[in-house]
């Protein structure tokens, strides 16, 4: 049998059954999530669930830039350090940079400090690049 690899929308990249779109526009976290959702197919800000997935994403983004942090789909909606993925994925894999999680920082970004392999918390109203993900 021939198994066809699903196709992603133009410009989105495919990895392990998912499509990813890297948006080089400035949005706060909630606006970024709304923009991801607008693409349908169950798209959300990206969940990153393994080191392999993190490495693939980091390598892709580093081909564009190495300085700007990028919103992902991890947030702390209750503001109690109870982090969860907006797409409902289980919060098992963690890659925090180790910086302080205090203050009014309840949304997660991929940090450029470690080539996008680690995450930092930031204020959700900051306008940043963002990464969307969906399963085709």
């Amino acid at each position: 049998d021939i198994i066809m690899r699903p196709s992603c929308a133009p410009g989105w990249f495919y990895h392990k059954s998912n499509c990813y779109g890297y948006f080089r526009k400035l949005r706060n976290w909630s606006d970024a999530e709304l923009e991801c959702q607008s693409y349908g197919n169950g798209a959300h800000l990206a969940s990153i669930l393994s080191l392999k997935e993190a490495s693939t994403i980091a390598e892709y983004i580093s081909g564009y830039q190495r300085s700007q942090p990028i919103w992902i789909g991890l947030h702390d909606p209750q503001k109690r350090q109870q982090w969860q993925w907006i797409d409902g994925a289980m919060y098992l894999y963690r890659s925090w940079s180790g910086k302080s999680m205090g203050g009014n920082k309840h949304c997660a970004e991929m940090s450029s400090n470690n080539n996008f392999l680690t995450w930092s918390s930031n204020e959700c109203n900051k306008r940043q690049h963002f990464l969307c993900k969906y399963r085709p």
Partner: antibody
């Protein structure tokens, strides 16, 4: 009021050189990236080169790389384009434009102000 | 990649016209798109930035949008006026470079 005034255009033979200048006023010149955009007679717009506000980063279109050099003097609020090894296909009106701001592969801000342009004609 | 625009468009005064700008590869949605108006004999003027934002002084008859399905950006001008006649260029970013569309000549009949 933002003003950009280009000068230095003219007729030059193929293989020759020319230096364009752009005098800027009405904004804090050193805070903004600047660009050169050209338009061949009857044709569309073509981005040529850009430089960061500090002058530390420069960018070029493939068509001019190695022949053109962009620079700026923030003490004089002036942008320059040194054009060497000129070819007939470089004939165009050259516009000085404010913006966009690019760093490490990421660009923001549009070309929000343009000069009137200066005509460069490369012909024997 | 390239940005492709129709060579020319004509419409009557008072009508609405939509100019398109199609990206050949990569997603039109990933980077901001700008639109510039160039009246005959004049320098370009910014009319839309960041996909759909209007600079101060540009009338609200001008609006921009992005359609990811067709991978294109659009500039819509309503209540067309004779002074809208000219060339319109879309522009986006490619790494540290700037890419312009070939331009659309808008004629107000």
């Amino acid at each position: 009021e933002v003003q950009l005034l280009e000068s230095g255009g003219g007729l030059v033979q193929p293989g020759g050189s020319l230096r364009l200048s752009c005098a800027a006023s009405g904004f804090t010149f050193s805070s903004y990236a600047m660009s050169w955009v050209r338009q061949a007679p009857g044709k569309g717009l073509e981005w040529v080169s850009a430089i960061s506000g500090s002058g530390g980063s420069t960018y070029y279109a493939d068509s001019v790389k190695g022949r053109f050099t962009i620079s700026r003097d923030n003490s004089k609020n002036t942008l320059y384009l040194q054009m060497n090894s000129l070819r007939a296909e470089d004939t165009a009106v050259y516009y000085c434009a404010k913006g966009p701001d690019c760093t490490n592969g990421v660009c923001y801000l549009p070309f929000d102000y343009w000069g009137r342009g200066t005509l460069v004609t490369v012909s024997s | 990649f390239m940005l492709t625009q129709p060579h020319s468009v004509s419409e009557s005064p008072g009508k609405t016209v939509t100019l398109s700008c199609t990206r050949s590869s990569g997603s039109i949605s990933f980077d901001y798109v700008q639109w510039y108006q160039q009246r005959p004999g004049s320098s370009p003027i910014l009319v839309i930035f960041e996909d759909d934002q209007r600079p101060s002084g540009v009338p609200d008859r001008f609006s921009g949008s992005i359609d990811s399905t067709s991978n294109s950006a659009s500039l819509t001008i309503s209540g067309l006026q004779s002074e809208d006649e000219g060339d319109y260029y879309c522009q986006t970013y490619d790494d540290n470079r700037q890419v312009f569309g070939g331009g659309t000549k808008l004629t107000v009949l």
